[in-house]
Interface confidence: low
C-alpha cells in the first residue's frame, strides 16, 4: 500500500490522527523536507544570539551572535566572547598576549612570533601583540652592494565585526 505521507510537501506534516492528511506545520515549527510525520521546533535566537533569518514553515531560523561575540560551529551553534586584537580569551576573561606572542583576531589564542632565523631570514618588521613579525631577506643578502628588499605592503586589517 502506498504511503500517502510521501505526498506531503515541505512545510507540512503527515497527521496520522487525520487518516494521513497533510497538515500545515503549527506556528514556530517547520519541515524542510516532504513526507515528514512531525514538524521540528524552530530555533530561537535568544540571549547572546540574534536572528539572522526568521523561521519559516519550510526552514529553520538562523542565528548570529550579538555585538561583542562571534559564532562557533557550523550553524552558529555557540557564541564566544570577543577579545581585542593583542589579547586571548582565558577562563578569567580577556588577557593581553605575553611578550613574543601575538593575536591578530578578536578570537583565538596568542601565538609565538615567527622565528625568521629558522628560514635563514632576518626580521624586517618587529612583531607586536597584534601582529606577527615580518621576515625579510637573510642578513647576507643585505650586504653592501646587494639590492635592498622592498618592504611588503602593510597587512590588510581583518574585518572589525566578529562575523
Amino acid at each position: 500500500l502506498q504511503d500517502l505521507c510521501s505526498n506531503c510537501p515541505a512545510g507540512t506534516f503527515c497527521d496520522n490522527n487525520r487518516s494521513q492528511i497533510c497538515s500545515p506545520c503549527p506556528p514556530n515549527s517547520f519541515s524542510s523536507a516532504g513526507g515528514q510525520r512531525t514538524c521540528d521546533i524552530c530555533r530561537q535566537c535568544k540571549g547572546v544570539f540574534k536572528t539572522r533569518k526568521e523561521c519559516s514553515s519550510t526552514s529553520n531560523a538562523e542565528c548570529d551572535c550579538i555585538s561583542g561575540y562571534h559564532c562557533l560551529g557550523a550553524e552558529c551553534s555557540m557564541c564566544e566572547q570577543d577579545c581585542k586584537q593583542g589579547q586571548e580569551l582565558t577562563k578569567k576573561g580577556c588577557k593581553d598576549c605575553c611578550f613574543g606572542t601575538f593575536n591578530d583576531q578578536k578570537r583565538g589564542i596568542c601565538r609565538p612570533w615567527t622565528n625568521c632565523s629558522l628560514d635563514g631570514k632576518s626580521v624586517l618588521v618587529n612583531g607586536t601583540k597584534e601582529r606577527d613579525v615580518v621576515c625579510g631577506p637573510s642578513p647576507a643578502d643585505l650586504s653592501p652592494g646587494a639590492s635592498s628588499a622592498t618592504p611588503p605592503a602593510p597587512a590588510r586589517e581583518p574585518g572589525h565585526s566578529p562575523q
Epitope: 557550523a74 609565538p112 590588510r156
Partner: antibody, heavy 112, light 110 residues
Framework: QSLEESGGRLVTPGTPLTLTCTAS????????MNWVRQAPGKGLEYIGI?????SAYYASWAKGRFTISRTSTTVDLRITSPTTEDTATYFC?????????WGQGTLVTVSS | AQVLTQTASSVSAPVGGTVTISCQSS????????LSWYQQKPGQRPKLLIY???TLAFGVPSRFKGSGSGTEFTLTISDLECDDAATYFC??????????FGGGTEVEVK
Amino acid sequence: QSLEESGGRLVTPGTPLTLTCTASGFSLSNYYMNWVRQAPGKGLEYIGIISSSGSAYYASWAKGRFTISRTSTTVDLRITSPTTEDTATYFCARGDYGMDLWGQGTLVTVSS
Amino acid sequence: AQVLTQTASSVSAPVGGTVTISCQSSQTVYNNNLLSWYQQKPGQRPKLLIYYASTLAFGVPSRFKGSGSGTEFTLTISDLECDDAATYFCQGGYSGWIYVFGGGTEVEVK
C-alpha cells in the same frame, strides 16, 4: 554557515592547479582558514593555515609544494607542481584552535 | 618533526559500552592543551568534537569526553550508540603554526 571548495579535477603531473574555498553565512576575512587533504582510504593530512591578515604557514612537507592565499571572499590553495601522490580530497576548514566548520571537499586526481 | 600517534588503528565495543582512544604527541602541544578531536564517517567531512583538549564543541553529546595535557591525550566515548561508528582523529598544534593529525582510530560498535 557553510564552506564550499571548488576547482578539483583531473590534471596531469606538473600542471599547476588552484582550489578555491568560498564561505556562505559568515565573513571569511575574520577567520584563520586551513587546508587539509585526505588521500583515498587514508587519514587526514594537514597542509597549512592562513591568518586573517594574510600570513600563511605550512606543514614542513608542504612548503614549496603549495601556496595559500586569500581575498576578502575566498581562500585559495595552489598546488604548484602536482604529482600522483597529491591525488586526494582537499578540504578547507575554519579556525585555529579547533576547526569548527569544514567544506565538503573537492577531489583532485593527478594522473598521466 | 612533531608526530601524533594513535596507538590503536581500530577498537570495538558493544552498544552501551565505552571506548577509549589515546593520542600521544612526540612534543608538548602549544599551551599544553592545543589538541582537538574529530569524528569522520565514510564519505563525509570531519566534525569537530573536542577542542582545547577537553572542551566539548557545541551540540556534541556529553558522552564524548576529552582529557589529557602536554603529550598524552585521551578521547572517551561512553554509552556507545550505533551512530558513533566512525574514524576519530586527534590534531595537535605547536609553536610556529605547526599542526599535525594523528593516524586515526576506527571505532566499531557491535
